[in-house]
Interface confidence: low
């Protein structure tokens, strides 16, 4: 047998999760505001046809996407960080970050949550961005247990401006192929997971037009083996 | 794929405890964050508690702390939730959810990847 015969019998026999996918969101969109964070979460309040919905939608449909763990979204996760009084700190000397573990001379961000959505208004939401994505996970149960350091820290770009706000750009959400086995598996689920984002793609740009800013973004999926089985999808195309 | 069974649930008095249990079948249940949701009726699914994948990390919603315990073996292949105090509101099916440990901790029902059946846990006089 070759080495990639032995690959995949043991794929099949020991695994029950396959590779990491990310989703990546190209830089253009304004999290800050609301219905643009409504084109994202998945919480209430939240559209239907939103990132995080559609996401799970694809997870739910295994068969054709290939997709087995639905991707958690950063902007839920910092909107529930937000709200909860033992997370975001600051130092007084400097407004600088300050560990959720931290006592004096520390203190509560106290940030304002507005309207029934309870999330950050513009100004808060770039102030405390970068907080979020510092936070470490306290695991002891009594601290904050939503920090998004370990979570987040490399899935959302983020460019300062005016020394304290934050603009968010790129971003990336990741979930979990299902298993797979063959080569037959391994190029549908590059084809199914680029279906998604085609569809993530369009529904946010049609969006984004009824905003009319301007704006288009691109979502495209990414995962370690993609490059070794793109030629697969256009194979037969490409020998006529 | 994991299969979740849930048991332990039955009618019990106010002020009473229950301890539900949910077996998983699978052989890498310790690579799963676990989670307890329940639904009363007429009302959305709602997030209870949640532990990570070694048990060093507890999160519970605010109407059962400080009642709710949850808890787990894996060697086991089991999560446990042990209700103390039970109050009449507290009545619902409930429900053990499992995901792969990705984000933080998990209190939305999107999150989980694999659901039980339920178990029905009723607290009346």
């Known amino acids: 047998d070759s080495f990639q015969t032995k690959y995949f019998q043991y794929l099949n026999r020991y695994l029950n999760i396959g590779p990491p996918v990310y989703f990546v969101v190209t830089e253009g969109l304004n999290y800050s505001d609301m219905d643009t964070q409504n084109m994202i979460c998945g919480t209430r309040f939240c559209r239907p046809d939103s990132l995080s919905m559609q996401l799970y939608a694809a997870y739910r449909n295994p068969n054709e996407t290939y997709i087995a763990q639905p991707p958690n979204s950063w902007l839920d996760d910092y909107f529930d960080w937000s709200a909860l009084p033992n997370c975001c700190k600051y130092f007084p000397s400097n407004s600088s970050f300050c560990p959720n573990d931290r006592g004096a001379p520390c203190k509560a961000c106290g940030i304002a949550l507005e309207g029934d959505e309870q999330r950050p208004n513009s100004t808060e939401f770039e102030r405390y961005v970068p907080f979020f994505l510092q936070d470490i996970p306290d695991t002891s149960g009594s601290g904050c247990v939503k920090g998004g350091h370990a979570a987040y820290g490399q899935a959302v770009n983020y460019k300062m401006f005016n020394k304290t706000q934050a603009h968010v750009g790129a971003t990336y959400y990741q979930g979990y192929h299902t298993v797979l086995k063959t080569s037959l598996d391994y190029y549908s689920a590059l084809k199914g997971a680029r279906e998604v984002a085609a569809n993530l793609t369009e529904t946010l740009n049609r969006n984004l037009k009824h905003q009319l800013n301007g704006t288009t973004i691109n979502v495209f999926p990414y995962s370690v083996f993609y490059v070794f089985y793109e030629q697969y999808l256009t194979m037969w195309p490409d020998t006529l | 794929q994991v299969q979740l069974q849930e048991s332990g649930g039955g009618v019990v008095q106010p002020g009473g405890s229950l301890r539900l249990s949910c077996a998983a079948s699978?052989?890498?249940?310790?690579?799963?964050?676990m989670g307890w949701f329940r639904q009363a009726p007429g009302k959305e699914r709602e997030f209870v508690a949640t532990?990570?994948?070694?048990?060093?990390?507890?999160y519970y919603a605010d109407s059962v702390k400080g009642r709710f315990t949850i808890s787990r073996d894996n060697a086991k292949n089991t999560v446990y939730l042990q209700m103390n105090g039970l109050k009449p509101e507290d009545t619902a099916v409930y429900y053990c959810?499992?995901?792969?440990?990705?984000?933080?901790?998990?209190?939305?029902?999107?999150?989980?990847?694999?659901w039980g059946q339920g178990t029905q846990v009723t607290v009346s006089s």
């Open positions: 699978g052989r890498t249940f310790s690579s799963y964050v």
């Open positions: 532990i990570s994948t070694g048990g060093g990390t507890t």
């Open positions: 959810a499992a995901k792969m440990a990705t984000g933080t901790a998990s209190i939305r029902t999107y999150e989980y990847a694999y």
